[in-house]
Each structure stands twice: as C-alpha cells, then as structure tokens.
C-alpha cells in the first residue's frame, strides 16, 4: 500500500517561516501533489500549492516557494509574516495523486519540542500512514 510522509520544520533564521516536505512511497507515477493547511484538502483545508510534474506549479500566499525535490517528494516554504502566517500548531497536509493507485494523503504539524536551531534529520520523519 502506498504511503505519504510529511515533515514540518521551523526555519532557524526566520522563526515564523516554515518548511514543509512531503514524499510519496509507492510504485505509481505521480500526476499531482496538493499541499494544504488547516486540514485535509477537500475537508476544510486551504490549498497552499499544487504541483504537476509537467504543467508546473501554482502556489498561494503565504506559500513562498514550492518545488520538486525528487520525482516523488516536494518541499514548500511559507512566509512568516502577516495575518495569514502559520502558527506552531498548524496542520499541514499533502495529497499525492498517483497512477494507477489513486490519491493518498497524510498530515503533520511542527513537533512539540521543535528547536529551530536543530537541523532536519537526514531521513524524512515522521512517516505517516496515508489514513
């Protein structure tokens, strides 16, 4: 069964800036990635970015930079200023549409004990089941 992992990190340089990384563990070819916050896409969440492997990338404030890291993982940097900026307990969700497996989603938020001075672990963590 495919799985999706989500990692949320606060930037050490800008304490109100976040980096969200998401990846897909499955055999299919990814046709679309949707990143949202405040809950799952289609269930109360607000879309931050949509990444298509060929059509390109669309993003909405406070998203600053969405990009493909690998063929099966993406990253998104969020601006930290303004009324729509995220807070420490904001939930971020990533949904991967993969052919032919379908759509798989996982959500994550900043770990409670986050220290912005610590670097990200070398492997994406936590890994969440897409359920």
């Amino acid at each position: 069964t495919p799985e999706v992992w989500v990692q949320v990190r606060m930037e050490a340089t800008e304490l109100s800036s976040f980096t969200i990384r998401c990846g897909f563990l499955g055999s299919g070819s990814i046709s679309l990635v949707t990143v949202s916050w405040g809950g799952p896409n289609g269930a109360g969440g607000t879309t931050l970015a949509v990444l298509h492997p060929e059509r390109g990338i669309r993003q909405w404030a406070p998203a600053r930079q969405a990009r493909w890291e690998t063929q099966s993982s993406i990253s998104l940097i969020l601006e930290g200023s303004g009324a729509s900026s995220p807070c420490a307990n904001t939930t971020f969700c990533c949904k991967f549409a993969s052919f032919p497996e379908g759509s798989w989603e996982a959500c994550g938020s900043l770990p409670p004990s986050s220290d912005p001075g610590l670097s990200a672990p070398p492997t994406p963590a936590p890994i969440l089941r897409a359920d």
């Epitope: 069964t1 046709s31 896409n41 949904k95 052919f99 032919p100 497996e101 759509s103 897409a130």
Partner: antibody, heavy 120, light 107 residues
Framework: EVQLQQSGPVLVKPGASVKMSCKAS????????MHWVKQSHGKSLEWIGI????????SYNQKFKGKATLTVDKSSSTAYMELDGLTSDDSAVYYC?????????????WGQGTSVTVSS | DIQMTQTTSSLSASLGDRITISCRAS??????LNWYLQKPDGTIKLLIY???RLHSGVPSRFSGSGSGTDYSLTITNLEQEDIATYFC?????????FGGGTKLEIK
C-alpha cells in the same frame, strides 16, 4: 456541472466487438482519471479498469485484460472502451465514472450507462 | 483482491426511520471506503467517500463511519427519494472492488 454522457444501447452478435463512448463536460477531461465499471443484470458492480486521460496510461483488472481496451480522445473530451470477442457473459450495463482525485479513491460522477446485449 | 461483503441484501423500512447499512472488507482498508446509491433507473451517485466525508450536494441525513475492516452507512429520517440500492466500494487497492449491494425498500 460535471456530466458524463454515454453512447446508446447496442445489440451485437457473439464474437463481434463494440466500442462505447463517454463524453465529459463541465470539467477538463485530462484533470481526472476515468474508470469503467460493469454491471451484469441484477448483479453488483465490477471494476474493469482506469485510464489517465492526460497521457493515456491504463491499468486493468486482470479479469478484463484482453477483453477491454480503454482510450481517450482529448480533442473531443471523450473516453472510449472497446470490448472484443463478445459472449453472452459480456451482456451488461457498462458505466464510465470519474475518479474523485480525493482520498478514498471514490468515483464521484457516473455516466448513465451503456447497455450491451450479446445475442445471435 | 479485497472482498467487500454487504451481509444484508435487502432492507425494508418506513419513511422517517433511521437505518444502517453495513459493509465489511476482507482486510484493513484504512478508511478507503466509499458509498454509492443506485436508483431504480440505473443512475449511480456518490454519497460518502473516505469512510465519513459527505460528497458535495449530498443531504446531511446521510453519514458514514467505521475503520479497519468494518464500515456503515446511516440514513436518518428516511425519505421516499432514498429508495435505492446502496453499494460500498474499497479504494485501498487495485482492483477496486464493490460490495454486493443492499436494496432499500419502503414498508
């Protein structure tokens, strides 16, 4: 409004082939996968396969490999299914259904169905 | 393949009733369970996806619940237009598979 309009009923002889259509409107065909589903008379639903209209990739239920062929014509926003070597077991109603592109992997909009009757 | 079982093939109820239709998967499907209704004319509509999320335009008297292998669809305050056959479908693995259906009739 999302709509899937399927072609009309057909009566075909055993051994023949049939090609049915499913015209999509109210959305861009290439943005959603398309499923095909079989319903024999008074029975449950059987998943035949799925096509990605963006690039034509397909995946079939093992049971229907060699029986069904899924294609799309992007210019007319139409998906097609061809059934070969028809027998009485292929007499059924066939539905096209749009993939929801949401978790759950549901089929959120369905065509009205195409009735196929195989009889000599 | 994942087998989907709807043990009740037909159900009789009165208008205004609350009814529950059950569906069991042969393995854990992690909430990847969807519910459809099929009207007597053959029209099929999605009601619930991902176990409990209401599809757009579906009345709130429909609700879904469950986890693991066991799921259910509940209709409260049954209306005449709810007379249909209800199917569950798993979206967890290929091939997609459906339950045998539960036909709802009015007493």
């Amino acid at each position: 409004e999302v709509q899937l309009q399927q072609s009309g009923p057909v009566l075909v002889k055993p051994g023949a082939s049939v090609k049915m259509s499913c015209k999509a409107s109210g959305y861009r065909l290439t943005d959603y996968y398309m499923h095909w589903v079989k319903q024999s008379h008074g029975k449950s639903l059987e998943w035949i396969g799925i096509i990605n209209p963006y690039n034509g990739d397909t995946s079939y239920n093992q049971k229907f490999k060699g029986k069904a062929t899924l294609t799309v014509d992007k210019s007319s926003s139409t998906a097609y299914m061809e059934l070969d070597g028809l027998t009485s077991d292929d007499s059924a109603v066939y539905y096209c259904a749009r993939d929801s592109s949401n978790v759950g992997n549901a089929m959120d909009y369905w065509g009205q169905g195409t009735s196929v009757t195989v009889s000599s | 393949d994942i087998q989907m079982t709807q043990t009740t093939s037909s159900l009789s109820a009165s208008l205004g009733d609350r009814i529950t239709i059950s569906c069991r998967a042969s393995q854990d499907i992690s909430n990847y369970l969807n519910w459809y209704l099929q009207k007597p004319d053959g029209t099929i509509k999605l009601l619930i996806y991902y176990s409990s999320r209401l599809h757009s335009g579906v009345p709130s008297r429909f609700s879904g619940s469950g986890s693991g292998t066991d799921y259910s669809l509940t209709i409260t305050n049954l209306e005449q237009e709810d007379i249909a056959t209800y199917f569950c479908q798993q979206g967890h693995a290929l091939p997609r598979t459906f339950g045998g259906g539960t036909k709802l009739e009015i007493k």
